[in-house]
């Protein structure tokens, strides 16, 4: 049990005991969510005491403060996910229509995702927020009509399901167009029929 | 309680530059960010920028980027900014604004305004 | 740029009477809006964030809406102290506030 001797800088516990050089012992090291009130000497381990409301340390430490909290930055395009405690600082991910553009360990800016032209759509991301958009062109039987970061492509109308023929086939930018059984085409769509 | 202290007004001459502070007291500046809002006379609101007070990063607007350097002071829970190159369209009042961790996207604290007058 | 523009920008209304006023954002904001209250001379007040909860101690008769581009502040009856100019603002992407609403008593 700490605080004990090493010759060798070593201690037993790494994640949780620190060597101190200056006695040249073990000690423990302060539990997330607290720091360092009074340092280990040869006869007394480690005080401790709980972070003060808005900060926090997230992990095993012998620090004589605690980090400050701080908020996710608008401005950078972030929100928070998760509040700051005293074990864990504030969580925070990208706006959504945003992807991270900068990471510095964690995102530190995001920026607007771009848009996806008419006739794409974006490629689905194994996580949201991750990188701009891929637009990939929409597969076969299906269209997209807009500019959009976010619009998906939708399968063209069956006009039989609706009880109507196709007056015109569907595009990767348009609908299937469709019309009454009964109404006429207009002159240009009728071709001449050859017996 | 948050509270933000600037001064009522700075008189300053064309061509030269004024400092403008704003004193938080109640709240930790190293938690937040500071933010600048002008207002020309009869007109609205329009955002400035903010700063960082524990690494002095700053983001402003294009418009002044060159025009206003803000500045934070940790041990005195100070923010500061400062417009150079004074021109009669600087006129307006300047408040300050901190976004907290429980108003991290809103302004729910103001400064009361410093009154920026530029005069020969 | 993302742009918000208020509408009305003058309205006079009387004691008692439901007032809406409407702020639109040029793109899709995903209600990401707050309103401000600023009477003359002193500084804008929080009145509801994130576009629709209340800020502490503000009356309940201020209640807001909205999604997408289109948001709206209504204050359900009227007040003599209501008299002041309202902005909206954006703070996705970036903050931007509206032109403001200057709302008078008839």
């Known amino acids: 049990v700490p605080p004990y001797g090493s010759e060798n800088q070593t201690c037993r516990d790494q994640e949780k005991e620190y060597y101190e050089p200056r006695h040249r012992i073990c000690c423990s090291r302060c539990p997330p969510g607290t720091y360092v009130s009074a340092k280990c000497s040869r006869s007394r381990d480690t005080v401790c005491a709980t972070c003060a409301e808005n900060s926090y340390n997230e992990h095993w430490n012998y620090l004589t403060i605690c980090q400050l909290c701080r908020p996710c930055d608008p401005v950078m395009g972030l929100e928070e996910i998760a509040p700051c405690t005293s074990k864990r600082k504030t969580q925070c991910r990208c706006q959504p229509g945003m992807f991270c553009a900068a990471w510095a360990l964690e995102c530190t800016h995001c920026e607007l995702l771009s848009d996806c032209p008419p006739g794409t759509e974006a490629e689905l991301k194994d996580e949201v927020g991750k990188g701009n958009n891929h637009c990939v062109p929409c597969k076969a039987g299906h269209f997209q009509n807009t500019s959009s970061p976010s619009a998906r492509c939708q399968p063209h109308t069956r006009c039989e399901d609706q009880g109507l023929v196709e007056a015109a086939p569907g595009t990767a930018q348009s609908d299937t167009t469709c019309r009454n059984p009964s109404e006429s085409l207009p002159p240009e769509m009728s071709g001449t029929m050859l017996m | 309680e948050v509270q933000l202290q600037q001064y009522g007004a700075e008189l300053g001459k064309p061509g030269t530059s004024v400092k403008l502070s704003c004193k938080v007291s109640?709240?930790?500046?190293?938690?937040?960010?500071i933010h600048w809002v002008i207002q020309r006379p009869g007109k609205g609101l329009e955002w400035i920028g903010r700063i960082d007070p524990t690494n002095g990063n700053t983001i402003s607007t294009e418009k002044f980027k060159n025009k206003a350097t803000l500045t934070a002071d940790l041990s005195s829970n100070t923010a500061y900014m400062q417009l150079s190159q004074l021109k009669s369209d600087d006129t307006a009042i300047y408040f300050c604004?901190?976004?907290?961790?429980?108003?991290?996207?809103?302004?729910?604290?103001w400064g009361q305004g410093t009154l920026v007058t530029v005069s020969s | 740029d993302i742009q918000m523009t208020q509408s009305p920008s003058q309205l006079s209304a009387s004691v008692g009477d439901r007032v809406t006023l409407s702020c639109k954002a040029s793109q899709n904001i995903y209600k990401y809006l707050n309103w401000y209250q600023q009477k003359l001379g002193e500084a804008p007040r929080l009145l509801i964030y994130s576009t629709n909860i209340l800020q502490t101690g503000i009356p309940s008769r201020f209640s807001g809406s909205g999604s997408g581009t289109d948001y709206t502040l209504t204050i359900s009856s009227l007040q003599p102290e209501d008299a002041a100019t309202y902005f909206c603002q954006k703070y996705y992407s970036g903050f931007t506030f509206g032109s403001g609403t200057k709302l008078e008593m008839k």
């Open positions: 109640g709240y930790n500046i190293g938690n937040t960010y």
């Open positions: 604004a901190p976004t907290t961790l429980t108003t991290p996207d809103s302004f729910a604290y």
